[in-house]
């Protein structure tokens, strides 16, 4: 007889995901020497322990603490770029700007990005068919307070000038319900950080507006400015050419406005 | 309260080993990571290395690598250092200090053990 | 390895006047430095974190500033209990590196 199984409203778990976690583990540790001690197994079993056999709605950030134990990378605290809706930019960034980091440059951060995950109480599967969609179901599941720990503790690392990439394109360009803007903003810790420099990133060729001046913006300074956190804002208004000029930053085009 | 005891002073041999111990209590041991420094007679702080107190795994400066070994007895809060083939230079007063290890950062050495002095001498 | 170099070596002060103590770093560290107190024959205790953020149970006569490369540990107006040896540490690199020290001395 089947047995009866919890219908969530999220797709279920990323096909193959042991195997995916082990994978990308062993591949990190293989490009980051730094990281090379890390026992790969070691770390699946923490990750796998923080979510099976646990009721999915009912996950802590207590359950992370032995993958966050053995995940610890010490990242350069004046190098971090935080991102919100607007990932695969914030990425290109960092592969060629190598000495900053997003979340998803760490080893925690690679392992989890673009996963979804989730057990069952009491059974030791993992369920493939469907797993609690953040706003339909329950906010405390497996993967949203997965990023919500590793999103905090990377916001707590930063100082200095702490960067962050926004999508122009968005109708909110700063969304206080976003992990950058419930958790992040929330964390960087003003005795260690000095500003929080804002990329507002436009989408349209001819868009000449200053989205710095958006009210989600001057939200954000406001949220930033009662932290006595500085607050500063660029516009990026052509993307192509802001990564061409971090590539080639000699290039005579590059002195004008991007 | 928060505190790190170490063992005793010990006089050695050349060629001797030594282990020093680091006793935890006062707070969950696994939270913070334990760090190892020397300090010579008359010298400055010169940082070991450190253990990471939940998966055992250490890390040692490049001048302590090969003849030094940290080590947990995690059941006892306890972080140990060993130190074989003892010589003359390893004479000093060695440290242990906890740091919160916040996953993407450390905090400062905000608690430190009394020091145990060593004594290499033939 | 990140360096850190403390200036001066020695400092003679006479007790109710003000002191700075430098250390500086050998690449930019953002404001991951860290200031001890060590006094004669006992542990190093923890002054400052984070360049400038105070530590309960330190006298406010101790300040910490600075970011990048170059900071500074401020005593206003020495009492006679602060001469002692003064370190920086940085935790900005997962290989923690010390100051040589500044002495404090009674001039």
């Known amino acids: 007889v089947p047995r009866w199984r919890q219908q969530w409203s999220g797709p279920g778990t990323t096909k193959r995901f042991p195997e995916t976690v082990l994978a990308r583990c062993v591949k990190y540790t293989e490009i980051h020497p730094e990281m090379r001690h890390v026992d790969c197994q070691s770390v699946w079993d923490a990750f796998k322990g923080a979510f099976i056999s646990k009721h999915p709605c009912n996950i802590t950030e207590e359950d992370y603490q032995p993958l966050m134990k053995l995940g610890t990378q010490t990242v350069p605290c004046n190098k971090i770029l935080l991102w919100s809706r607007i990932k695969d930019l914030a990425h290109q960034f960092t592969q060629v700007q190598r000495d900053m980091f997003t979340l998803e440059d760490t080893l925690l951060g690679y392992l989890a990005d673009d996963l979804t995950w989730c057990g069952e109480f009491n059974t030791s599967k993992i369920n493939y068919q469907s797993c609690p969609d953040w706003r339909k179901d329950c906010s405390n599941n497996p993967v949203s307070v997965f990023w919500k720990t590793v999103s905090r503790r990377f916001a707590e690392a930063a100082c200095d000038v702490v960067h962050v990439m926004l999508n122009g394109s968005r109708s909110k360009i700063f969304d206080k319900n976003s992990t950058f803007g419930s958790v992040e903003v929330h964390n960087l810790q003003p005795e260690k950080v000095q500003t929080l420099e804002a990329w507002v990133i436009h989408g349209g060729r001819e868009d000449s507006r200053d989205l710095c001046q958006d009210p989600t913006i001057k939200e954000l300074e406001s949220i930033i400015s009662k932290r006595n956190i500085q607050f500063s804002c660029k516009n990026i208004y052509r993307p192509d050419k802001f990564l061409q000029c971090v590539k080639n930053p000699e290039d005579s085009s590059c002195t004008s406005e991007i | 309260q928060i505190q790190l005891v170490q063992s005793g002073p010990g006089l050695k041999k050349p060629g001797e080993s030594v282990k020093i111990s680091c006793k935890a209590s006062?707070?969950?041991?696994?939270?913070?990571?334990m760090h190892w420094v020397k300090q010579a007679p008359g010298k400055g702080l010169q940082w070991m290395g450190w253990?990471?107190?939940?998966?055992?795994?250490?890390t040692y400066a490049a001048d302590f690598k090969g003849r030094f070994v940290f080590s947990l007895e995690a059941s006892a809060s306890t972080a140990n250092l060993q130190i074989s083939n003892l010589k003359n230079e390893d004479t000093a007063t060695y440290f242990c200090?906890?740091?919160?290890?916040?996953?993407?950062?450390?905090?400062?050495?905000?608690?430190w053990g009394q020091g145990t002095s060593v004594t290499v001498s033939s | 390895n990140i360096v850190l170099t403390q200036s001066p070596a020695t400092l003679s002060v006479t007790p109710g006047e003000s002191v700075s103590l430098s250390c500086r770093a050998s690449?930019?560290?953002?404001?991951?430095i860290h200031w001890y107190q060590q006094k004669s024959n006992e542990s190093p205790r923890l002054l400052i974190r984070?360049?400038?953020q105070s530590i309960s149970g330190i006298p406010s006569r101790f300040s910490g500033s600075g970011s990048g490369t170059d900071f500074t540990l401020s005593i206003n107006r020495v009492e006679s209990e602060d001469f002692s040896i003064y370190y920086c540490?940085?935790?900005?690199?997962?290989?923690?590196?010390f100051g040589s020290g500044t002495k404090l001395e009674i001039k």
């Open positions: 253990i990471n107190t939940y998966s055992g795994k250490p």
């Open positions: 984070y360049a400038s």
């Open positions: 690449q930019s560290i953002g404001t991951s």
């Open positions: 540490q940085q935790s900005y690199s997962s290989l923690v590196t």
């Open positions: 200090a906890r740091c919160y290890d916040g996953t993407f950062y450390y905090d400062p050495m905000d608690a």
């Open positions: 006062g707070y969950t041991f696994t939270d913070y990571s």
